[in-house]
Amino acid sequence: MAVTACQGLGFVVSLIGIAGIIAATCMDQWSTQDLYNNPVTAVFNYQGLWRSCVRESSGFTECRGYFTLLGLPAMLQAVRALMIVGIVLGAIGLLVSIFALKCIRIGSMEDSAKANMTLTSGIMFIVSGLCAIAGVSVFANMLVTNFWMSTANMYTGMGGMVQTVQTRYTFGAALFVGWVAGGLTLIGGVMMCIACRGLAPEETNYKAVSYHASGHSVAYKPGGFKASTGFGSNTKNKKIYDGGARTEDEVQSYPSKHDYV
């Protein structure tokens, strides 16, 4: 029971996490204009991994995609790559984990196979979560570096009468979504790995021993304790290591695309 619950919960948590990673990757608000020096700006800038946007006080919003590939900073390319790798690994992990779920029966699949698939998906979720956390952290570090650089520039060369305010950027909503989503995916992966251990206990086969009693010859053959799917008609002499209960619930969380435009 505990194993199935752990596996199911790990799957759901990872699903939510991956949906969050997809949402964060698509979001435009990775960095938002810092309003500390100009809280009453009539023009608000924010940027994502794929495009930058300007929202005017009039309500008009204009977004422009980064149509160049070579002209983009290497760090941004790296963040994009990390997020995409995270999504791909997470998606594959989800696909594998669906077949690995103990509550889903596919043919006469052995529990050892399900255990291997659970471990595989768990590792994929862990790597996916780490990719997302790394991607978001690299971007955040880039923002912090640029923020202090632009702050230094802002207070130098202001001898003239005309003041040119340099736009500074701070953390956007997508960073927090990414961190949380990455963390959830990581936790889900760990839960899947824990569930894997309970799914595949080592087989302990006891040799058949014959006890000869006078008058009767009765052979006691204790069946080897073996993990089973419980699938099929003959379940005699089989100990099912899932506590007997199964959940048929499938919790689905669809990736939501947050459009801030």
């Epitope: 800038n45 940027q47 946007c53 005017e56 009039s58 005309v162």
Partner: antibody
Framework: EVQLVESGGGLVKPGGSRKLSCAAS????????MHWVRQAPEKGLEWIAH????????YYADTMKGRFTISRDNAKNTLFLQMTSLRSEDTAMYYC???????????WGQGTSVTVSS | DIVMTQSPSSLTVTAGEKVTMNCKSS????????????LTWYQQKPGQPPKLLIY???TRESGVPDRFTGSGSGTDFTLTISSVQAEDLTVYYC?????????FGAGTKLELK
């Protein structure tokens, strides 16, 4: 055709109050931010206040803050300007205007005149 | 607050002449996010409300004759009328659309020589 018609102007005593209205037609009022701008006789344009399409964001000129209140009723397609503690220097033609891209004011009403005098 | 300074305050011209008026802001109106300058030009005829001519410093509003051209970037802007017509002899205002409070220049008045 876009139309903005101001009303509520007139003669007011110093320290008095007045509520100006701006009736909008010919466009989806609830989609646009709106502004009040005034012009004293033989003087230039002076911005008063801005209200966003859903009334979530409001800005005032420092000199008018606390005395003037901008509001809107999207159901009635009407913009308002409540003016209190009026002074002689508030004598002007009051215009309402529609806010569009580029943070520009593309359509203006004909204006309503407010005279503050004892 | 951003201070808008227009020059000259008045300009005497003849019909058909090319006219240039200036507007200077105390702070840059160039937005780095879209590389657009948030400066607007208006024309106001006596007894009428202002009319939008140009926004984003150089984008002509629909219906505005192409003899009106806006230019400039950062803090220095210009409105040029390539061939002045009689109906153009009125007052022109520039406006900051970059930050609140939205501020207007004192205006440039075009008069017939």
């Amino acid at each position: 055709e876009v139309q903005l018609v101001e009303s509520g102007g007139g003669l007011v005593k110093p320290g008095g109050s007045r509520k100006l209205s701006c009736a909008a037609s010919g466009f989806t009022f609830s989609d646009y931010g709106m502004h009040w701008v005034r012009q004293a006789p033989e003087k230039g344009l002076e911005w008063i206040a801005h209200i966003s399409s859903g009334s979530s964001t409001i800005y005032y000129a420092d000199t008018m803050k606390g005395r003037f209140t901008i509001s809107r009723d999207n159901a009635k397609n009407t913009l308002f300007l409540q003016m209190t503690s009026l002074r002689s220097e508030d004598t002007a033609m009051y215009y309402c205007a529609r806010f569009v891209r580029g943070n520009a004011l593309d359509y203006w009403g004909q204006g309503t005149s407010v005279t503050v005098s004892s | 607050d951003i201070v808008m300074t227009q020059s000259p305050s008045s300009l005497t011209v003849t019909a058909g002449e090319k006219v240039t008026m200036n507007c200077k802001s105390s702070q840059s109106l160039l937005n780095s996010g879209n590389q657009k300058n948030y400066l607007t030009w208006y024309q106001q005829k006596p007894g009428q409300p202002p009319k939008l001519l140009i926004y984003w410093a150089s984008t002509r509003e629909s219906g505005v004759p192409d003899r009106f051209t806006g230019s400039g970037s950062g803090t220095d802007f210009t409105l040029t009328i390539s061939s002045v017509q009689a109906e153009d002899l009125t007052v022109y205002y520039c406006q900051n659309g970059y930050s609140y409070p939205l501020t207007f220049g004192a205006g440039t008045k075009l008069e017939l020589k």
